[in-house]
Interface confidence: low
Amino acid sequence: VPRWRQQWSGPGTTKRFPETVLARCVKYTEIHPEMRHVDCQSVWDAFKGAFISKHPCNITEEDYQPLMKLGTQTVPCNKILLWSRIKDLAHQFTQVQRDMFTLEDTLLGYLADDLTWCGEFNTSKINYQSCPDWRKDCSNNPVSVFWKTVSRRFAEAACDVVHVMLNGSRSKIFDKNSTFGSVEVHNLQPEKVQTLEAWVIHGGREDSRDLCQDPTIKELESIISKRNIQFSCKNIYRPDKFLQCVKNPEDSSCTSEI
């Protein structure tokens, strides 16, 4: 019998996916003492169980529940940084501002960051050739459902002032179809979250516009306000200087607007 595989539109499972997940888990649990109790083989087992032998267009949040349970983690609920279309800067920020956390600073986010994975219906094989694309094939694919699940839980855990970093260089600074716009915004809990503060990151050095007045930011403000959560917005005109000032807040140049 020839090895026939469904051809999907997206790239296949990341090379060495099982080993990458296991290695990341071991590394994370070594670095984070509060997660030392985590059994990484069981984590991989639960991860694999979520998508192996299942049709990659028919994955549900329930498939990931065993993994979610094993990866349960408490982060300070008032130190959460969400981001949309500007992951690298968000991660650079939390690497400096160590008491703040993006989703990828949690175990589950760290395990899956930048990885692709999918299986095949009725076989125990991982598909390294292709995986479903969210737009061209199906939205209920293993990767999309994973991020939807962990993002929802992350947003639900947030409290007090929640920050979100947005990319001011994009045509849609706030995109309702992004994970932030479609999942996280709607799962912030009004009884716990007082304010959502958006940081709009400027791309060009000479860009002095107030991007907080952008129509998509106003749309975000409207959505958030309707949920009885306050909204505030700040322009970050110089992201390089912004990071530098996070590192060295005493620097004299850090008193001016960044």
């Epitope: 020839p2 090895r3 090379k15 060495r16 996916f17 099982p18 080993e19 059994d39 083989q41 069981s42 087992d45 694999k48 125990s124 094989k125 991982i126 390294y128």
Partner: antibody, heavy 117, light 110 residues
Framework: QEQLEESGGDLVKPEGSLTLTCTAS????????ICWVRQAPGKGLEWIAC???????TYYASWAKGRFSISKTSSTTVTLQMTSLTVADTATYFC???????????WGPGTLVTVSS | AQVLTQTPSPVSAAVGGTVTINCQAS????????LAWYQQKPGQPPKLLIY???NLASGVPSRFSASGSGTQFTLTISEVQSDDAATYYC??????????FGGGTEVVVK
Amino acid sequence: QEQLEESGGDLVKPEGSLTLTCTASGFSFSNDAICWVRQAPGKGLEWIACIYAGSGNTYYASWAKGRFSISKTSSTTVTLQMTSLTVADTATYFCASADTIDYFNLWGPGTLVTVSS
Amino acid sequence: AQVLTQTPSPVSAAVGGTVTINCQASQSVYNNNYLAWYQQKPGQPPKLLIYRASNLASGVPSRFSASGSGTQFTLTISEVQSDDAATYYCQAYYRDPTTAFGGGTEVVVK
């Protein structure tokens, strides 16, 4: 059809060396674990070693460390090098693959290694 | 070293009857369920029957079932057929990572 086949089994003198080869047909080793298991005549199965094809990481039974060496030589071949052979190493040597490392879902027919003077 | 003890051996069964084979591990297998069962006939390689303690491998008849957790595991063959005459092995996985096989149980069908 996915198949494994062992080769290299032979009659060898004590203290001699031998290299066995496991060849895959109908598929290539991607992220499978490829393992060697042996069975002495009329006896049970004994695990020797595994290699994780994706990374090249190797795992050995405690008794096999030092005398046995597993390696992936191509996308479809894995070898087992055996040194300082004794009469007790006489067995049929099977190669087996595992989707994960904990159970073997595909086996070769085996190759006989006889150690005798 | 981890030891897997299989009992009884040999075991005989009549066609249509039921056979139960036990496998006891000297220490808990990984995740309490990383145990597999294989069938081996003379001159052939082993064939996977059960993985992760109770999951039936592809193409294996439902007459074969298994259960257990931790250190105690059982393989059951119901409605035994003459073709079931073989030696059955349990195999455990431990975190080290190491693998161990039981000594085997010969099933004789009368």
